[in-house]
């Protein structure tokens, strides 16, 4: 039996700049029941506070609701582990909510096979920004990637589309079924997870419909 090992703050992420969650990895428990507490202060302020909500985001996490989230402040966050034999504290993590945004994936992915005047076939991929994103006001600007692969292929083909919410994919094989996903990233943040997979079959004898 021994004091607990040093915990490590794994990451902090915000879906929308309005709330955020931090997760930690506990160290060894020293063979004893161990309690974990997350404390934080804001740069330039004296007070230290305890995590407002240990439940919402699951085990080894702390959820900061709107009430506890400020975007123009740097949070200094530590996790403390305590058991009967002693305690240990993580290295502090400095968090600026503006820089930890990981949004929801784009929504309303639609796939349509189309044809140019020269009979060249392409797949027209369109989507919408994630629901919480207020793109128009500049609160968020999102960049996007799409990925696709034929059902038989092992590797995804990735296309960066910038701020555009549509993309035309050329040189596809007729008769093949393609899987497509999209993801997005705000200016200073992280890529979302890949969104829901959609599939479409490229017809063998595609003819333009009026």
């Amino acid at each position: 039996q021994s004091p607990p090992g040093k915990p490590e703050i794994h990451k902090c992420r915000s879906p929308d700049k309005e709330t955020f969650t931090c997760w930690w990895n506990p160290g060894s428990d020293g063979g004893l029941p161990t309690n974990y507490s997350l404390t934080y202060s804001k740069e330039g302020e004296k007070n230290t506070y305890e995590c407002p909500d240990y439940k919402t985001s699951g085990p080894n996490s702390c959820f900061f609701s709107k009430q506890y989230t400020s975007i123009w402040k740097i949070y200094i966050i530590t996790v403390n582990a305590t058991n009967e034999m002693g305690s240990s504290t993580s290295d502090p993590l400095y968090v600026d909510v503006t820089y930890i945004v990981e949004p929801e994936p784009p929504r309303n992915l639609t796939l349509e096979v189309k044809q140019l005047k020269d009979k060249k076939t392409y797949l027209w991929v369109k989507w919408l920004p994630p629901t919480i994103t207020d793109v128009k006001t500049g609160w968020f600007t999102m960049e996007y990637e799409i990925r696709l692969k034929s059902e038989e292929a092992d590797e995804w083909e990735i296309h960066f589309t910038g701020h555009q919410t549509q993309f035309k994919v050329f040189d596809l094989y007729p008769g093949q079924k393609y899987l497509v996903q999209t993801r997005c990233k705000p200016d200073h943040g992280y890529w979302s997870r890949w969104g829901q997979e959609k599939s479409i079959e490229i017809p063998n004898d595609f003819t333009l419909k009026d």
Partner: antibody, heavy 120, light 107 residues
Framework: EVQLQQSGPELVKPGASVKISCKAS????????IHWVKQSHGKSLEWIGY????????GYNQKFKSKATLTVDNSSSTAYMEVRSLTSEDSAVYYC?????????????WGQGTSVTVSS | DIQMTQSPASLSASVGETVTITCRAS??????LAWYQQKQGKPPQLLVY???TLAEGVPSRFSGGGSGTQFSLKINSLQPEDFGSYYC?????????FGSGTKLEIK
């Protein structure tokens, strides 16, 4: 015919700012990205950033993030780049270019360039 | 950032000859490569995008090839108007970067 017409040459003092314009014609302005590229005398090309007029989305080369600001005025189909805190290192020809309508990063039409000279 | 290494830095050739310029990306950029031609005092002009697609109005003596990290631009039967500087540029994801250029001169 697609055209990008840039503003004239600038001679500016160190520490000052300059705002270059790029007026687009011959296509739907909001459908295409506008890129900005720097070319120092006798050197290669450096991508500064781009703006998508449809939603004012921007992407910057980190090197220029605190140096340049990209904006658009959709009513006049004009893109602008402001370069601030100028030093001799900023003396260069600056180009605006239209991004291909599908592939974001290749630039199919270019402005004639705006020469910026920083000198006291 | 993805680095683009272009070679040679300069080359001399005669009208009618065939020349090849190469470009190497520091990581996989699939087929996201463009080639530009630039004449003295003028803006660059797009020649090729997506590694091998000729831009509108570009003569068929120009051809692009390669994918992944190795790319080339081939000019068959050089014409007097082909002399100038050539740049490769990846357009895979931001930041987009250019090669250092190849100056093609008349021998």
């Amino acid at each position: 015919e697609v055209q990008l017409q840039q503003s004239g040459p600038e001679l500016v003092k160190p520490g000052a700012s300059v705002k270059i314009s790029c007026k687009a014609s011959g296509y739907t302005f909001t459908d295409y990205n506008i890129h900005w590229v720097k070319q120092s005398h006798g050197k290669s090309l450096e991508w500064i950033g781009y703006i998508y007029p449809n939603n004012d989305g921007t992407g910057y080369n980190q090197k220029f993030k605190s140096k340049a600001t990209l904006t658009v005025d959709n009513s006049s189909s004009t893109a602008y780049m402001e370069v601030r805190s100028l030093t001799s290192e900023d003396s260069a020809v600056y180009y605006c270019a239209r991004g291909d309508g599908n592939y974001v990063g290749d630039m199919d039409y270019w402005g004639q360039g705006t020469s910026v000279t920083v000198s006291s | 950032d993805i680095q683009m290494t272009q070679s040679p830095a300069s080359l001399s050739a005669s009208v009618g000859e065939t020349v090849t310029i190469t470009c190497r990306a520091s990581e996989n950029i699939y087929s996201y490569l463009a080639w530009y031609q630039q004449k003295q005092g003028k803006p660059p002009q797009l020649l090729v995008y997506n590694a091998k697609t000729l831009a509108e109005g570009v003569p068929s003596r120009f051809s692009g090839g390669g994918s992944g990290t190795q790319f080339s631009l081939k000019i068959n039967s050089l014409q007097p108007e082909d002399f100038g500087s050539y740049y490769c540029q990846h357009h895979y994801a931001t930041p987009f970067t250019f090669g250092s250029g190849t100056k093609l001169e008349i021998k």
